[in-house]
């Protein structure tokens, strides 16, 4: 079948990294610089993706595979194949349309990306707060008050220093 197909279509013999050149009697020509063909039998080579500006090259383009981009430090990839870069924030912050903002009281973010999430409500599981939450860390829940030995006490979260929902400036 392969022989029959190649007799009918000389282009099917052209391997990845080449294209079937109609201008040169359908011989297999190497892909020009900054282009590639990832499969055989191609009539054109595709232009490589350019990783420019906020993007940096994670993998160079070759004659058989496209370039791959990631983001420069201070940004992280979003979208299919890193089609966008989003600004990093610090732990304890989230990204809003106006930039990085500290997590509101009662919420935390332990990553440089994503949104602030509410602290775990230990009492919903019948547990007590063992370690208080911060902007960067969730609370740590301990055993339920009933599980504590006589005389032991659980850590009580301090009263909020400001109105819940207000973000420090």
């Amino acid at each position: 079948f392969e022989r029959t197909r190649s007799l009918q279509d000389p282009c099917s013999n052209c391997p990845a990294g080449t294209f079937c050149d109609n201008n040169r009697n359908q011989i297999c020509s190497p892909c020009p610089p900054n282009s590639f063909s990832s499969a055989g039998g191609q009539r054109t080579c595709d232009i490589c993706r350019q990783c420019k500006g906020v993007f940096r090259t994670r993998k160079e383009c070759s004659s058989t595979s496209n370039a791959e981009c990631d983001c420069t430090p201070g940004f992280h990839c979003l979208g299919a194949g890193c089609s966008m870069c989003e600004q990093d924030c610090k732990q304890g912050q989230e990204l809003t349309k106006k930039g990085c903002k500290d997590c509101c009281f009662g919420t935390f973010n332990d990553q440089k990306r994503g949104i602030c999430r509410p602290w775990t409500n230990c009492s919903l599981d019948g547990k007590s707060v063992l370690v208080n939450g911060t902007k960067e860390r969730d609370v740590v829940c301990g055993p339920s008050p009933a599980d504590l030995s006589p005389g032991a006490s659980s850590v009580t979260p301090p009263a909020p220093a400001r109105e819940p929902g207000h973000s420090p400036q």
Epitope: R49, Q50, K52, T72, F75, A80, C85, E86, Q87, K98
Partner: antibody, heavy 123, light 106 residues
Framework: EVQLVESGGGLVQPGGSLRLSCAAS??????????VGWIRQAPGKGLEWIGE???????YYSPSLKSRVTISRDNSKNTLYLQLNSLKAEDTAVYYC???????????????WGQGTLVTVSS | DIQLTQSPSSLSASVGDRVTITCRAS??????LAWYQQKPGKAPKLLIY???SLESGVPSRFSGSGSGTDFTLTISSLQPEDFATYYC????????FGQGTKVEIK
């Protein structure tokens, strides 16, 4: 608030040169990830990308204009420049500068545009 | 260069109509495509980036779709202020714009 203001347009003789300025405010041209480009539009025609400069100083140019164009910037003035040489009548257009990316997400699109400056090439 | 071909070049529509504009790339460009609206005497305005992400402040009647070589801008219910020229733009390799689609009043 991001603002881009072009200046330097006007009447230029064929064969001459133009130097356009784009004053940026609300952001710094040297901030990591920032790219600013020049795009032009001939009367009644579509948009044509000319070139781009990044925070790193790296530049990219349209292949059809590469031999005649230079994009530069002055970080102390937060200003971008376009130099175009050997002008022809076909270079008559409104020239826009535009910044890549949106507020917190950036990529290869133009979210902020200046109002444009008209360049007329005629004797 | 990567070429972008928009269709139609112009169209006539009425307020309330659903309008679809297509943009075809000469090769695959993943989702690295944006759409702009331009009114006479004004600078273009970004509507959609990354093929389908709506720019902040743009009405939700605008939407984008597609990946690879075929992309679409849809206006779900045309409003009087939407009569303008629309351009697609790729940034996959350098930058190029489509030739534009003029949306006129029927």
């Amino acid at each position: 608030e991001v603002q881009l203001v072009e200046s330097g347009g006007g009447l230029v003789q064929p064969g001459g040169s133009l130097r356009l300025s784009c004053a940026a405010s609300g952001f710094s041209l040297s901030t990591s990830g920032v790219g600013v480009g020049w795009i032009r539009q001939a009367p009644g025609k579509g948009l044509e990308w000319i070139g781009e400069i990044y925070h790193s100083g790296s530049t990219y140019y349209s292949p059809s204009l590469k031999s005649r164009v230079t994009i530069s910037r002055d970080n102390s003035k937060n200003t971008l420049y376009l130099q175009l040489n050997s002008l022809k009548a076909e270079d008559t257009a409104v020239y826009y500068c535009a910044r890549e990316g949106s507020d917190v997400v950036t990529g290869d699109w133009f979210a902020y545009w200046g109002q444009g400056t008209l360049v007329t090439v005629s004797s | 260069d990567i070429q972008l071909t928009q269709s139609p070049s112009s169209l006539s529509a009425s307020v309330g109509d659903r309008v679809t504009i297509t943009c075809r790339a000469s090769q695959g460009i993943s989702s690295v495509l944006a759409w702009y609206q331009q009114k006479p005497g004004k600078a273009p305005k970004l509507l959609i980036y990354d093929a389908s992400s709506l720019e902040s402040g743009v009405p939700s009647r605008f939407s984008g779709s597609g990946s690879g070589t075929d992309f679409t801008l849809t206006i779900s219910s045309l409003q009087p202020e939407d009569f303008a020229t629309y351009y697609c733009q790729q940034g996959y390799s350098l930058w190029t714009f489509g030739q534009g689609t003029k949306v006129e009043i029927k």
